[in-house]
Amino acid sequence: ARNGDRCPLGPGRCCRLHTVHASLEDLGWADWVLSPREVQVTMCIGACPSQFREANMHAQIKMNLHRLKPDTVPAPCCVPASYNPMVLIQKTDTGVSLQTYDDLLAKDCHCV
Amino acid sequence: ARNGDRCPLGPGRCCRLHTVHASLEDLGWADWVLSPREVQVTMCIGACPSQFREANMHAQIKMNLHRLKPDTVPAPCCVPASYNPMVLIQKTDTGVSLQTYDDLLAKDCHCV
């Protein structure tokens, strides 16, 4: 693994893709989504230690300034680098439709 | 202001653009950047309460699941929505060059 992919905090502690099982009720969608009633939500969770999956130079700067001024500048944060599309079957004015959402499920993660 | 831009925690507490004054030493760039010696680093800092500057549907999901499972799912986090380019004058093998960096300074912020 590249240095930027090896977690210094121990396996699974750093920024990575997690799957969270959620019902439509959990998501607040129960009144407009028909199916599926359970969704496997992929999201980015974990710590962003120095040099770990840094998205860009801004993330490097942020980490350096966080070290100097931890009360002012937060550490970089684990967010989606890209998304997977997802289909929801939902009620519409005219009936029922299959709707694609492109920004719903994280595909991979990085630190920003 | 749209509802998503009004901070419920009080002025300046929510996710927004901040300017942090930093020297090349602060940034760890002193050995390869000649100028400028001081940089006004714009970065995204602040809390991401519910519905505040949500980047997309993923951010909505994350907030809903954070409310339900705060120990498992973190709240959305304040990150750059876009960047401003910046020019650095730097040392190279052949001398000195002007180099543009597109991902260095945050231009605006949102919650993901």
Partner: antibody, heavy 119, light 107 residues
Framework: QVQLVQSGAEVKKPGASVKVSCKAS????????INWVRQAPGQGLEWMGW????????VYAQKLQGRVTMTTDTSTSTAYMELRSLRSDDTAVYYC????????????WGQGTMVTVSS | DIQMTQSPSSVSASVGDRVTITCRAS??????LAWYQQKPGKAPKLLIY???SLQSGVPSRFSGSGSGTDFTLTISSLQPEDFATYYC?????????FGGGTKVEIK
């Protein structure tokens, strides 16, 4: 494991009705929809419609609208497809299939029910 | 309705051959295309979903690619159990529609 088990073969006269059942097991029946797909002898697959067990909402193929009714019984985790005013060209194997899921997948199929329409 | 056009309608191939089947949608369907294998007297079996994701338990010699309107199913090295009919199916919008099928026969 996830399974869909359909009712047995039927022989019907033209003008009659048929009701095919599809019993689900191995997953929460109300979490996903059920499609009905048919296949005439030697032909390809034809989608007939979809129902969600959760609310009973349906979508039917236009050519079958008015002749087909899809229902579910959540107490027995069973889906039903009734086709009325049968014609000889309704002779086919009728399948139930789970989905589409969040990745638009129709992943588990019943074994099929042969319906023969003959005078 | 979205029309799905599969080609070829049949292909003769030998064990070990690489086989490619294409499917074209009459309008863009994002990546919402699935591929099924069907053997005589049996229900269709899901091989590939979301254009390129391999269904659990399906051998890795099957692969899918494409997005928008043009999609491909590839069998990298044909095995005796792969002789069957293959269907593509879109689930981008209702009504869900299938391609006409491609029969893979022994040469």
């Amino acid at each position: 494991q996830v399974q869909l088990v359909q009712s047995g073969a039927e022989v019907k006269k033209p003008g009659a009705s048929v009701k095919v059942s599809c019993k689900a097991s191995g997953y929460t029946f109300t979490d996903e929809g059920i499609n009905w797909v048919r296949q005439a002898p030697g032909q390809g697959l034809e989608w007939m419609g979809w129902i969600t067990a959760y609310s009973g909402d349906t979508v039917y193929a236009q050519k079958l609208q008015g002749r087909v009714t899809m229902t579910t019984d959540t107490s027995t985790s069973t889906a039903y497809m009734e086709l009325r005013s049968l014609r000889s060209d309704d002779t086919a194997v009728y399948y139930c299939a789970r989905g589409p899921g969040q990745y638009a997948d129709v992943d588990v199929w019943g074994q099929g029910t042969m319906v023969t329409v003959s005078s | 309705d979205i029309q799905m056009t599969q080609s070829p309608s049949s292909v003769s191939a030998s064990v070990g051959d690489r086989v490619t089947i294409t499917c074209r949608a009459s309008q863009g369907i994002s990546s919402w295309l699935a591929w099924y294998q069907q053997k005589p007297g049996k229900a269709p079996k899901l091989l590939i979903y979301a254009a390129s994701s391999l269904q659990s338990g399906v051998p890795s010699r099957f692969s899918g690619s494409g997005s928008g309107t043009d999609f491909t199913l590839t069998i990298s090295s044909l095995q005796p159990e792969d002789f069957a009919t293959y269907y593509c199916q879109q689930a981008n919008s209702f009504p869900i529609t299938f391609g006409g099928g491609t029969k893979v026969e022994i040469k």
